[in-house]
């Protein structure tokens, strides 16, 4: 049993840091491996992550952390029994990847105006909480080719766009990701998409000029 | 919400020891580390030492490394420090604090243990 | 050991203003800087932990920041309960140490 690509990992930069790795043939990662980490610190305490399987010889574990600061360094075992497969080290700080925004919501009740907000994944007492930023994926499920991205780089969690800049009497979804500069993370995951019909009544001048074409 | 009981006040003799507990309301005592710290009085805050007690590991200041001994019984989530050799500089009101594992910072302190050394 | 000097020794601000306490160690921390306050007769509590972050349950008044050797707690707008003895605390190498204490007091 080897370990054909070894383990990267990436945290939350809060309470979980995923690490994923590839062996080098089908194995049940539950029953056969185990990811030993610890923080490199005085009286710090060794932990055991039980990996799940990631396709036929991946594995993903999902390491539990009390707290990340950004000098926390990890070392990392891997053990098939009493064998070490690979040994390694991981700064959580240096390979974010941010929790995913949530409960995305389009508020159409304004007149010609979209409003699209969505929370922040942290708590505010979280390092990130104050240094997201965000894009905005909005696209046509009827046109693939109308699909576009809005950058969102100041830190409230929301952005309004003219109804009119999207084709009116379709529908559109939405989705959200995150990321923060500070730490040069990776963007998040996508949030979940929400979905949308747009309808706008088009100023009579608009209407009546585009009648003449 | 984490609380730390210690034991009562002290009134030793110099060369005598004593030896004081801190009994910690947390569901796993192995997730932390008691660490023992003393005030003088009027004076400030010096860190005595510190154990983890799932693995019994201890660093100690060099200061106290020969007279003070750190261990817990993880049974009933209790620390003990026991100081030996006692001078009336050892006056002090003692503190246990928690810190989860591995940390540096003080998280939840115990009301103290005045010990008081006197001929 | 590192040497931690906090200033100033004491202070008295009135209710509102803005407090600032330093703390100074004898060589790099790298950040593993605490704050603690403490009232009289009672045990220190736990305000800002690793520089400046909030520990649970502290008024957002409380902040902190520096870097390397230098550090500084602040109060935005004082209290008449955020009287008390401040004291900072190194834990990057040992011996852990603190620093001499600042009494904050009400003019």
């Known amino acids: 049993m080897k370990v054909l690509q070894e383990p990267t990992c990436v945290s939350d930069y809060m309470s979980i840091s995923t690490c994923e790795w590839k062996m080098n043939g089908p194995t049940n990662c539950s029953t056969e491996l185990r990811l030993l980490y610890q923080l490199v610190f005085l009286l710090s305490e060794a932990h055991t992550c039980i990996p799940e399987n990631n396709g036929g010889a991946g594995c993903v574990c999902h390491l539990l952390m009390d707290d990340v600061v950004s000098a926390d360094n990890y070392t990392l075992d891997l053990w098939a029994g009493q064998q070490l497969l690979w040994k390694g080290s991981f700064k959580p700080s240096e390979h974010v990847k941010p929790r995913a925004p949530g409960n995305l919501t389009v508020h159409t009740n304004v007149s010609d105006t979209l409003l699209l907000t969505w929370s922040n994944p942290y708590p505010p007492d979280n390092y990130l909480y104050n240094h997201l930023t965000y894009a905005v994926n909005i696209w046509s499920e009827n046109d693939p080719a109308d699909f576009r991205i809005y950058n969102v780089t100041y830190l409230e969690p929301s952005l309004r766009i003219a109804a009119s800049t999207l084709k009116s009497g379709i529908s559109y979804r939405a989705r959200v990701r995150a990321w923060a500069q500070c730490y040069n993370t990776t963007w998040s995951e996508w949030s979940p998409s929400t979905k949308w019909h747009n309808s706008y009544r088009e100023p009579f001048e608009q209407h009546h000029h585009h009648h003449h074409h | 919400q984490v609380q730390l009981v210690q034991s009562g006040a002290e009134v030793k003799k110099p060369g005598a020891s004593v030896k004081m507990s801190c009994k910690a309301s947390v569901y796993t005592f192995t997730g932390y580390n008691m660490h023992w710290v003393r005030q003088a009085p009027g004076q400030g805050l010096e860190w005595i030492g510190g154990?983890?007690?799932?693995?019994?590991?201890?660093s100690y200041n060099q200061k106290f490394k020969d007279r003070a001994t750190l261990t817990a019984d993880r049974s009933s989530n209790t620390a003990y420090m026991e100081l030996s050799s006692l001078r009336s500089e050892d006056t002090a009101v003692y503190y246990c604090?928690?810190?989860?594992?591995?940390?540096?910072?003080?998280?939840?302190w115990g009301q103290g243990t005045l010990v008081t050394v006197s001929s | 050991d590192i040497q931690m000097t906090q200033s100033p020794s004491s202070l008295s601000a009135s209710v509102g203003d803005r407090v600032t306490i330093t703390c100074q160690a004898s060589q790099d921390i790298s950040n593993y800087l605490n704050w603690y306050q403490q009232k009289p007769g009672k045990a220190p509590k736990l305000l800002i932990y690793y520089t400046s972050r909030l520990h649970s349950g502290v008024p957002s008044r409380f902040s902190g920041s520096g870097s390397g050797t230098d550090y500084t707690f602040t109060i935005s707008s004082l209290q008449p309960e955020d009287i008390a003895t401040y004291f900072c605390?190194?834990?990057?190498?040992?011996?852990?140490?603190f620093g001499g204490g600042t009494k904050v007091e009400i003019k």
């Open positions: 154990l983890h007690p799932g693995n019994g590991d201890t």
């Open positions: 604090a928690l810190t989860t594992a591995g940390r540096a910072w003080f998280a939840y």
């Open positions: 605390q190194q834990g990057n190498t040992l011996p852990w140490t």
